[in-house]
Interface confidence: medium
């Protein structure tokens, strides 16, 4: 395993008052390998609402790097390959669980954290507000 | 908190050999609350690749309820509101980290698990395979 310089303020894993704390085996089990899912690997380029991936890094978090989808256009790509501004490219967002070292530098103490990430984009009909 | 009937085979949290195990505080911190993100709440209906949401529940998993997107059509909705089969509605998939009780029914022993979920759908140009 890894040897980490221990923060003297690290919580005691035997402390019965350690809030809502559980033991977690970090040997991540992957439930996906048998299902052989169809990957969304190249959809970011082929979509009518294409997106780019932007890097967000935080060394105190797992995963340390999260690539966020940012829609390339306000509108959507039409059949001619042009941007149609009568439609809107919008991000599809989803919360994911990440692990954060807490307190920082403690080798075996983490907090679960929810963060919102943009996974990709979809093309929607705009909501038109008519002014009376 | 929730009371779970304890499995007599539950690992001892003080067992130094408990594999690659750490303490995780489940008092989840939500980094999203201040950002007030624009929710993708009605995109599933307004998208040119609309989707339905299906509930997936598993009491041995945290979070126990996950909503899965299923694309409504093989094709995409065109400007006339009809399904255009020259385009494809495809699910945007992403992996999420979840906690699974392991062994089952242990109140404070979990394993990290990656599962693949469909978050929404996007409309893509199909890959056409030309037969020689």
């Amino acid at each position: 395993g890894i040897t980490i310089p221990r923060n003297p303020g690290c919580p005691n894993s035997e402390d019965k008052n350690f809030p809502r704390t559980v033991m977690v085996n970090l040997n991540i089990h992957n439930r996906n390998t048998n299902t052989n899912p169809k990957r969304s690997s190249d959809y970011y380029n082929r979509s009518t609402s294409p997106w780019n991936l932007h890097r967000n890094e935080d060394p105190e978090r797992y995963p340390s790097v999260i690539w966020e989808a940012k829609c390339r256009h306000l509108g959507c790509i039409n059949a001619d390959g042009n941007v149609d501004y009568h439609m809107n490219s919008v991000p599809i967002q989803q919360e994911i669980l990440v692990l954060r070292r807490e307190p920082p530098h403690c080798p075996n103490s983490f907090r679960l954290e929810k963060i919102l990430v943009s996974v990709g984009c979809t093309c929607v009909t705009p909501i038109v507000h008519h002014v009376a | 908190g929730i009371t779970i009937p304890r499995n007599p085979g539950c690992p001892n949290s003080e067992d130094k050999n408990f594999p690659r195990t750490v303490m995780v505080n489940l008092n989840i911190h939500n980094r999203n609350t201040n950002t007030n993100p624009k929710r993708s709440s009605d995109y599933y209906n307004r998208s040119t690749s609309p989707w339905n949401l299906h509930r997936n529940e598993d009491p041995e998993r945290y979070p126990s309820v996950i909503w899965e997107a299923k694309c409504r059509h093989l094709g995409c909705i065109n400007a006339d509101g009809n399904v255009d089969y020259h385009m494809n509605s495809v699910p945007i998939q992403q992996e999420i980290l979840v906690l699974r009780r392991e062994p089952p029914h242990c109140p404070n022993s979990f394993r990290l698990e990656k599962i693949l979920v469909s978050v929404g759908c996007t409309c893509v140009t199909p890959i056409v395979h030309h037969v020689a």
């Epitope: 797992y62 690539w67 | 750490v22 992996e95």
Partner: antibody
């Protein structure tokens, strides 16, 4: 820029053990994992296993299970690979390679090796 | 384990020519395929990650494409310094595996 510097060449006898170090500099050590890859003379690349520095979880290729141990020390930003029960088939160049902990396009997955050590030549001979 | 099969095993090419190397996976690996270049007595160097994304600093003549089981590395306008062995690598399912390599030399 991340740099990985490995320990020097080794000559071992069959049955002995080997421990190679890989010192990382540049970037945050816990933002990536370290994998070990070997290359026998005139052959291709073979993944042996890797460690996620963030929390020390390790994965080993089945072929090396029970014979290889991968560890890391965050205070010295150094990863180690120990291989026991050496035979002449273990004669190879051993590389450490950096593997980012990334959530890429919707996937938490093992990744590309974006930086490599210079390699450690290991000869096993009686 | 996933087997990656590269073709050709060897290619002798004239400078400025286009080079195409293919890598076929024994099962669907999405886009989790990466390409490396290794010159004699040197460590491998990452060229393309995730099938089509260039590693920073890699010349624009190198490009990658494909997803699922079939992938391609293209060198548009080979230069003398591109001689070496090229490997594909999948990181989708453990154990991570490499192709057997394609040796490219300059005529």
């Amino acid at each position: 820029e991340v740099q990985l510097v490995q320990s020097g060449a080794e000559v071992k006898k069959p049955g002995e053990s080997l421990k190679i170090s890989c010192k990382a500099s540049g970037g945050s050590f816990r933002s990536y994992g370290i994998s070990w890859v070997r290359q026998a003379p005139g052959q291709g690349l073979e993944w042996m296993g890797g460690i996620t520095n963030f929390f020390g979880a390790v994965d080993y290729a089945q072929k090396f299970q029970g014979r290889v141990t991968i560890t890391a020390d965050e205070s010295t930003t150094t990863a180690y690979m120990e291989l026991s029960g050496l035979t002449s088939d273990d004669t190879a160049v051993y590389y450490c390679a950096r593997e980012p902990n990334e959530f890429w396009n919707g996937y938490y997955t093992t990744h590309d090796f974006d930086a490599w050590g210079q390699g450690t030549t290991v000869t096993v001979s009686s | 384990e996933i087997v990656l099969t590269q073709s050709p095993d060897f290619q002798s090419v004239t400078p400025k020519e286009k080079v195409t190397i293919t890598c076929r996976a024994s099962q669907d690996i999405g886009a989790a395929l990466h390409w490396y270049q290794q010159k004699p007595d040197q460590s491998p160097k990452l060229l393309i990650k995730y099938a089509s994304h260039s590693n920073p600093g890699v010349p624009s003549r190198f490009s990658g494409s494909g997803s699922g089981t079939d992938f391609t590395l293209t060198i548009n306008g080979l230069e003398a310094e591109d001689a070496g062995t090229y490997y594909c690598h999948q990181s989708d399912i453990l154990p991570q595996t490499f192709g057997q390599g394609t040796k490219v030399d300059i005529k």
